[in-house]
Amino acid sequence: MNGSEYFVKIQSFLGGAPTEDLKALSQQNVSMDLATFMKLRTDAVLPLTVAEVQKLLGPHVEGLKAEERHRPVRDWILRQRQDDLDTLGLGLQGGIPNGYLVLDLSMQEALSGTPCLLGP
């Protein structure tokens, strides 16, 4: 069974998938469509790297542009380095600027909804 066939079988169960499962899926050429990606748990999507999301979505990655202001895409963009987002060539904006450090202050992030940044 190839990645696409596997994805069709598990698609309806993905809404509650944890990050680890999504990372594993990204290695299987599943080409997840944007509607499915948008239904994933935000907390499961946030830790994914740009490279992992690119592999997870495959040719559908360009669809991130259309959904850049919707959750969970918007929240995921805010967590990525702008340099990494730029590698997608989609013009996605709102990533962490070059030279900034991301402090994983869980309590502050939980309160504010965005990571804490330290400038250069």
Epitope: D33, L34, A35, M38, K39, H60, E62, G63, L64, K65, A66, E67, R69, H70, R71, G91
Partner: antibody
Framework: EVQLQQSGPELVKPGASVKIPCKAS????????MDWVKQSRGKSLEWIGD????????IYNQKFEGRATLTVDKYSSTAYMELRGLTSEDTAVYFC????????????WGTGTTVTVSS | QLVLTQSPAIMSASPGEKVTLTCSAS???????LSWYLQKPGSSPKLWIY???NLASGVPARFSGSGSGTSYSLTISSMEAEDAASYFC?????????FGGGTKLEIK
């Protein structure tokens, strides 16, 4: 057959609100975005905003932010646009339009609802 | 916001004539993010062309779309009476999504 059915014409007074329904059929409403577009008489089209029905997340054209609210009742497969504080400038035809998630084009349009604001 | 300017605003063409409608953007738009809609009086708009050059389902092959950057066009190779309508270009490259002012195409 995929269809978006909207309600009939509305005549409302200045300052009042209107809530326009858009009933989706022939597909699963939570699998697509729903956008709303305004067309003033004899004029072009203006994007109001869109909602992702699965989680109700909505985004708006800044021009309509604060006055428009987009919602969805998943169980009746109906999207709604509420517009508040109406003025004569809001007299127009309002369309709902289905947008395949991950694209920016509208592949199915509603029948349109004419809203006339007049005292 | 990104402004789309369509020209001409109104034009008429004879049956069999080649017709070109243009859409000019105030800043560059990726070809993926440009589409065209057709609208007849009293009706809802219909998706006609998406991603600059892809014909929507049911659109006759006499229609084509092309362009890049700030300049896009819709061409009808041989005008037919049923092509008389208003045509709107649309971009989703930047928020808010915007539409051109439209070109009303009439049959002579």
């Amino acid at each position: 057959e995929v269809q978006l059915q909207q309600s009939g014409p509305e005549l409302v007074k200045p300052g009042a609100s209107v809530k326009i329904p858009c009933k989706a059929s022939g597909y699963t409403i939570t699998d697509y975005n729903m956008d709303w577009v305004k067309q003033s008489r004899g004029k072009s089209l203006e994007w109001i905003g869109d909602v992702f029905p699965y989680n109700g997340d909505s985004i708006y054209n800044q021009k309509f932010e604060g006055r428009a609210t987009l919602t969805v009742d998943k169980y009746s497969s109906t999207a709604y646009m509420e517009l508040r504080g109406l003025t004569s400038e809001d007299t127009a035809v309002y369309f709902c339009a289905r947008r395949k998630t991950g694209t920016g084009y509208f592949d199915v349009w509603g029948t349109g609802t004419t809203v006339t604001v007049s005292s | 916001q990104l402004v789309l300017t369509q020209s001409p605003a109104i034009m008429s063409a004879s049956p069999g004539e080649k017709v070109t409608l243009t859409c000019s953007a105030s800043s560059s738009v990726s070809s993926t993010y440009l589409s065209w809609y057709l609208q007849k009086p009293g009706s809802s708009p219909k998706l006609w062309i998406y991603s600059t050059s892809n014909l929507a389902s049911g659109v006759p092959a006499r229609f084509s779309g092309s362009g890049s950057g700030t300049s896009y066009s819709l061409t009808i190779s041989s005008m037919e009476a049923e092509d008389a309508a208003s045509y709107f270009c649309h971009q989703w490259s930047s928020y808010p999504y915007t539409f051109g002012g439209g070109t009303k195409l009439e049959i002579k």
